[in-house]
């Protein structure tokens, strides 16, 4: 990996061993304030592989609310507006980082956790295995 | 929101004010280790709105490497394998949390940051505005 020269003004680290505990400022800096509002929120309805969004809430996690996508159909919507089952609607999944309260119910102590979330759906051609 | 009864075994919090600084254990717990490998990594190629994945690296961020999707075409692939420009390939974007080293180059001090990433692409029907 890349070696980062250490800033002499860094806070002292108590524990140099893993599992590594670090200080994190929860005052979120949002880099997306100037992102284009055209990134349409209606893709879930206009897609040929449309999806619904479901609220996943967990008070022991930060962020406590995550929205998960669930494809509406097994197939994809064709030009006539019907479901074509020769194509497949599949969820696009991404691993994201969240903070899990550890020990449980502690407001100031967390552990990093990776979770897999479904962000939306896409239409794919099915894999067909031909027997020799 | 949901009130969480405080665990008496929680570490002491030095600073009760915002911006709130918390302790985070970076020894990541992966909740997805046993999810099925069938969540195919080849959707980017098989999709009717295929995409390429680009590596975005930033040593001041945790995770330092994030993969970003970029749609290959403006249109979508039709049944004949050609690009149909009457449909649109669009990126599905998601806001994710990352840790930004703050002050810069510090190994044990971070600030939460929200960034917008493109996870994959989906094929949508275009919005057509009819002029009166």
């Amino acid at each position: 990996g890349i070696t980062i020269p250490r800033n002499p003004g860094c806070p002292n680290s108590e524990d140099k061993n893993f599992p590594r505990t670090v200080m994190v400022n929860l005052n979120i800096h949002n880099r997306n304030t100037n992102t284009n509002p055209k990134r349409s929120s209606d893709y879930y309805n206009r897609s040929t592989s449309p999806w619904n969004l479901h609220r996943n809430e967990d008070p022991e996690r930060y962020p406590s609310v995550i929205w998960e996508a669930k494809c509406r159909h097994l197939g994809c919507i064709n030009a006539d507006g019907n479901v074509d089952y020769h194509m497949n609607s599949v969820p696009i999944q991404q691993e994201i980082l969240v903070l899990r309260r550890e020990p449980p119910h502690c407001p100031n102590s967390f552990r990093l956790e990776k979770i897999l979330v479904s962000v939306g759906c896409t239409c794919v051609t099915p894999i067909v295995h031909h027997v020799a | 929101g949901i009130t969480i009864p405080r665990n008496p075994g929680c570490p002491n919090s030095e600073d009760k004010n915002f911006p709130r600084t918390v302790m985070v254990n970076l020894n990541i717990h992966n909740r997805n280790t046993n999810t099925n490998p069938k969540r195919s990594s080849d959707y980017y190629n098989r999709s009717t709105s295929p995409w390429n994945l680009h590596r975005n690296e930033d040593p001041e961020r945790y995770p330092s490497v994030i993969w970003e999707a970029k749609c290959r075409h403006l249109g979508c692939i039709n049944a004949d394998g050609n690009v149909d420009y009457h449909m649109n390939s669009v990126p599905i974007q998601q806001e994710i949390l990352v840790l930004r080293r703050e002050p810069p180059h510090c190994p044990n001090s971070f600030r939460l940051e929200k960034i917008l990433v493109s996870v994959g692409c989906t094929c949508v029907t275009p919005i057509v505005h009819h002029v009166a």
Epitope: H86, V117 | T35
Partner: antibody, heavy 126, light 111 residues
Framework: EVQLVESGGGLVQPGGSLRLSCAAS?????????MCWVRQAPGKGLEWIGC????????YYASWAKGRFTISRDNSKNTVYLQMNSLRAEDTAVYYC??????????????????WGQGTLVTVSS | DIQMTQSPSSLSASVGDRVTITCQAS??????LSWYQQKPGKAPKLLIY???TLTSGVPSRFSGSGSGTDFTLTISSLQPEDFATYYC??????????????FGGGTKLTV
């Protein structure tokens, strides 16, 4: 270790009720898993009862099971349940809990069941 | 509901034989079909999903084919551990939120 463990089976009288539990370990219900119940009468074939989506709570049932059988889940306990009412002698079977093979946001449990519990025997008899 | 008809219901074969089991759906389920193997006193084991995709860890002598209403499970060269009962299962859901999950009657494969 990833596993499913059923419990709650036993002897019940005709007309009685029973609630079976299926505790999952090694994976979390956080997100979309389809958890299903399947039964097998002694010496007979497999019979699908129904499934629940742990993400949004949507349930799917075999037509014969609607009304008498109810599937629910408690994500905080990583457990799914099968509530069986108005039990009859023909409901005597080994009841299996199983997980659909595909994780995360598919429209239906369409990928087969890759993880099964050991089964719990339910006997309906007077 | 969709009916799944499996044939034959029983089959005798020898080690090394090529064996074919068929499954017919009462209406099209496209490629939404799974195959399972079950041994006495054990839970079923998923072999194939989406008609032809082999589950991780399943030997390549097992293969599946078909779409629509007609499906086939083939064991290219029978091994002693393959003697068991085999089931097909539909996994098809439609846009009207009707979901069809039905097992075939099973095929008992004996020596």
């Amino acid at each position: 270790e990833v596993q499913l463990v059923e419990s709650g089976g036993g002897l019940v009288q005709p007309g009685g009720s029973l609630r079976l539990s299926c505790a999952a370990s090694g994976f979390s219900f956080s997100g979309f898993y389809y958890m299903c119940w399947v039964r097998q009468a002694p010496g007979k074939g497999l019979e699908w009862i129904g499934c629940i989506d742990t993400g949004d709570g949507t349930t799917y049932y075999a037509s014969w099971a609607k009304g008498r059988f109810t599937i629910s889940r408690d994500n905080s306990k990583n457990t799914v349940y099968l509530q069986m009412n108005s039990l009859r002698a023909e409901d005597t079977a080994v009841y299996y809990c199983a997980r659909d093979a595909a994780y995360g946001g598919y429209a239906y449990p369409a990928h087969g069941m890759d993880l099964w519990g050991q089964g719990t025997l339910v006997t309906v008899s007077s | 509901d969709i009916q799944m008809t499996q044939s034959p219901s029983s089959l005798s074969a020898s080690v090394g034989d090529r064996v074919t089991i068929t499954c017919q759906a009462s209406e099209s389920i496209y490629r939404y079909l799974s195959w399972y193997q079950q041994k006495p006193g054990k839970a079923p084991k998923l072999l194939i999903y989406l008609a032809s995709t082999l589950t991780s860890g399943v030997p390549s002598r097992f293969s599946g084919s078909g779409s629509g209403t007609d499906f086939t499970l083939t064991i290219s060269s029978l091994q002693p551990e393959d003697f068991a009962t085999y089931y097909c299962q539909s996994n098809f859901g439609t846009a009207s939120t009707t979901y069809y999950n039905t097992f075939g009657g099973g095929t008992k494969l004996t020596v």
